[in-house]
């Protein structure tokens, strides 16, 4: 079974800069899985942001402008990266990665 670790406990960024969050996958080949990213804003329900499927297809939350969140998958390091562009106050949240084993 796959195991996920998010090595960064927290990340602090200056407004308008770029944040990159990592999710390390072990116990399974990352390219044979779909990785999902979610966020939980303070006082709000958890929300899907973006995913990358086993075949490389990216799907985002339809209500968020394309380009805001970017997802990547690096097989060499078995890592998925969530990039948050143009960081704003609205991005203050806890971010979670999740795995779907195909």
């Amino acid at each position: 079974a796959g195991h996920l670790e998010q090595p960064q406990i927290s990340s602090t960024k200056t407004l308008s800069k770029t944040a990159r969050l990592e999710c390390v996958v072990s116990g399974i080949t990352i390219s044979a899985t779909s990785v999902y990213w979610y966020r939980e804003r303070p006082g709000e329900v958890i929300q899907f942001l973006v995913s990358i499927s086993y075949d490389g297809t990216v799907r985002k939350e339809s209500g968020i402008p394309s380009g805001k969140f970017e997802v990547d998958r690096i097989p060499e390091t078995s890592t998925s990266t969530l990039t948050i562009h143009n960081v704003e106050k609205q991005d203050i949240a806890t971010y979670y990665c999740a795995l779907w084993e195909v």
Epitope: R59, G63, I64, P65, G67, K68, H85, Q90
Partner: antibody, heavy 118, light 106 residues
Amino acid sequence: EVQLVESGGGLVRPGGSLRLSCEASGFTFSSYSMIWVRQAPGKGLEWVSSISSSSDYIYNADSVKGRFTISRDNAKNSLYLQMNSLRAEDTAVYYCARDWELLGFDCWGQGTTVTVSS
Amino acid sequence: SYELMQPPSVSVSPGQTASITCSGDKLGDKYACWYQQKPGQSPVLVIYQHNKRPSGIPERFSGSNSGKTATLTISGTQAMDEADYYCQAWDSTTVVFGGGTKLTVL
């Protein structure tokens, strides 16, 4: 059938204002991010503004910052573009488009023409 | 600011293969889309995420993207494919379009 219909275009003097509307039907408008794109006569496509479904993310092209304001009313299935301090170079066909979850703009309106001239 | 460069025009004979290029810094790391626009009509998405076709788009349309160049390929080009084609990508939260390429089917 997914449909977007723009309105509100017309002839306006330099320095004047105009408000464009885009009415959506055939899909759950409140779930989608939307954009405005314009096309000057004989020229290419130029992005103008983007807005998230809940209006918490708003982005504008440098060429319209401080002059144009994008907004939406999900209860009315409508997207708006308030254009102030209009210039001759704002003359264009203005399109609204839906921001697809698979990355790309998959549905476009027919466009509304804005002419800025004295 | 980020720019996408396209050739102003490309010509092709009916039944032949047309290739339209789009170049930009690190474009291969971004998700490229292509739009077709016929005179007096609105743009239509023909390729998304480098090489995927929306439903209803003929199989003769394909795309690729690597390095600094994205390419739209139309195999067995038909007269109805004559149009302007625009590439598009995102630079952070900014939407960027190429200048457009007029495809002429001779």
